[in-house]
Interface confidence: low
Amino acid sequence: MKTLPAMLGTGKLFWVFFLIPYLDIWNIHGKESCDVQLYIKRQSEHSILAGDPFELECPVKYCANRPHVTWCKLNGTTCVKLEDRQTSWKEEKNISFFILHFEPVLPNDNGSYRCSANFQSNLIESHSTTLYVTDVKSASERPSKDEMASRPWLLYRLLPLGGLPLLITTCFCLFCCLRRHQGKQNELSDTAGREINLVDAHLKSEQTEASTRQNSQVLLSETGIYDNDPDLCFRMQEGSEVYSNPCLEENKPGIVYASLNHSVIGPNSRLARNVKEAPTEYASICVRS
């Protein structure tokens, strides 16, 4: 009967293993859940420069098997999967990071992103995180806060294209004007071309409504006011779907550019469609001796 103690030992061992799940011995972190968790903060944002490399991190907590994680970019109410983008995992002591690589950051990377994890047939979605991309090339010519809501950004985009003919026309008109001026000293030209006048305008803060995010340079996202980016002064009023622009101060002079009467709002337009343009003004050039 020497087998009896051995059998008893095996029996005890069996009960220990049987009770382990109930005793929570496996759980190293105490009472922490073994569910997959995505630790992207609500209202998180990153202000980054175009041209720089950047790693967008999705902190993932899991226990045994690493879940399948993907990144997507918010486009209105849908989140478009970023399957062709370079991603990687970075393992830290108590948390892992699923990283979306930007090599480098492009201006159109501006927008809200979300990571999601597939775990045991469950889909877990993170909060969205917002990238605010500053285009370094246009940084020197970026408008002030006061101009932000009123400048027709389309004009900005069209200037490189339309600027040359405009310049030639202006020069031609000036040339004609000067010739007339030389020929008739006392005669003044009434209309010397349609030069855009930069006027002092008193801009008023206007409330705008939006229920979907715009993937434009001005991103209406679920985040709070971004005090540190001069270009981003829209905030979502808490508990509502109304966006307002608190950054415009009344009676502050700003530059208003004349409209080119283009009604096309393309994907490159930096102005959210619902932001009203300021009235435009024109002026004639009068050359005096």
Epitope: Q37, K41, R42, F97, R235, E238
Partner: antibody, heavy 119, light 108 residues
Framework: QVQLQESGPGLVKPSETLSLTCTVH????????WSWIRQPPGKGLEWIGY???????KYNPSLKSRVSISVDTSKNQFSLKLTSVTAADTAVYYC?????????????WGQGTTVTVSS | EIVLTQSPGTLSLSPGERATLSCRAS???????LAWYQQKPGQAPRLLIY???SRATGIPDRFSGSGSGTDFTLTISRLEPEDFAVYYC?????????FGQGTKVEIK
């Protein structure tokens, strides 16, 4: 164990710029938010602003026009600059690490450095 | 800006007694974004509670946090001599962090 050490001049003249540096010892500056908080003598805590290791910043609106926070990941340091100081800026300045995932608690603090604004 | 109002300003109690500290927000705060800190004279604040009710590493279980929305509470079940200090609540609102003005727990 992560420790934070504030350094900088203890006395600053009015209208000058206050500059402080926080060095992170025993851990990486990566993956965390790094905040500056101050406490005027006998008063409560006031959050100044934070910087994420990537360089993203957010500031207290009441100080925004005067404050800037920068990070140097190679030196494991982040810095605070406060311009045009007055006597009201006299305080103990703390740097703190903020756990960046899900919760917003400041789990590690420096011991604080006293800055007096006086001529 | 979310304003946090702590009450009472000062709490005079004896060791072994129960302390109940209140923190009221001017508008709703997510429970995930409320923390409590303890500060002793000449020292930096120390994290006690995060996410309104989770104890930080190394914090004794006599400290507990509760509440949601605009009303949050820090409870010290049995005051120890080392618990006499100033306690601050802190939140992360829509745009930045704010602290309450503090509650001083002093020996009666």
């Amino acid at each position: 164990q992560v420790q934070l050490q504030e350094s900088g001049p203890g006395l600053v003249k009015p209208s000058e710029t206050l500059s402080l540096t926080c060095t992170v010892h025993g851990g990486s500056i990566n993956h965390y938010y790094w905040s500056w908080i101050r406490q005027p003598p006998g008063k409560g805590l006031e959050w100044i602003g934070y910087i994420y290791y990537s360089g993203s910043t957010k500031y207290n609106p009441s100080l925004k026009s005067r404050v800037s926070i920068s990070v140097d990941t190679s030196k494991n340091q982040f810095s605070l600059k406060l311009t045009s100081v007055t006597a009201a800026d006299t305080a103990v300045y703390y740097c703190a690490r903020e756990w960046p995932y899900y919760y917003y608690e400041m789990d590690v603090w420096g011991q604080g450095t006293t800055v007096t604004v006086s001529s | 800006e979310i304003v946090l109002t702590q009450s009472p300003g000062t709490l005079s109690l004896s060791p072994g007694e129960r302390a109940t500290l209140s923190c009221r927000a001017s508008q709703s705060v997510s429970s995930s974004y409320l923390a409590w800190y303890q500060q002793k004279p000449g020292q930096a604040p120390r994290l006690l509670i995060y996410g309104a009710s989770s104890r930080a590493t190394g914090i004794p279980d006599r400290f507990s946090g509760s509440g949601s929305g605009t009303d949050f509470t820090l409870t010290i079940s049995r005051l120890e001599p080392e618990d006499f200090a100033v306690y601050y609540c802190q939140q992360y609102g829509s745009s930045f962090r704010t602290f309450g003005q503090g509650t001083k727990v002093e020996i009666k």
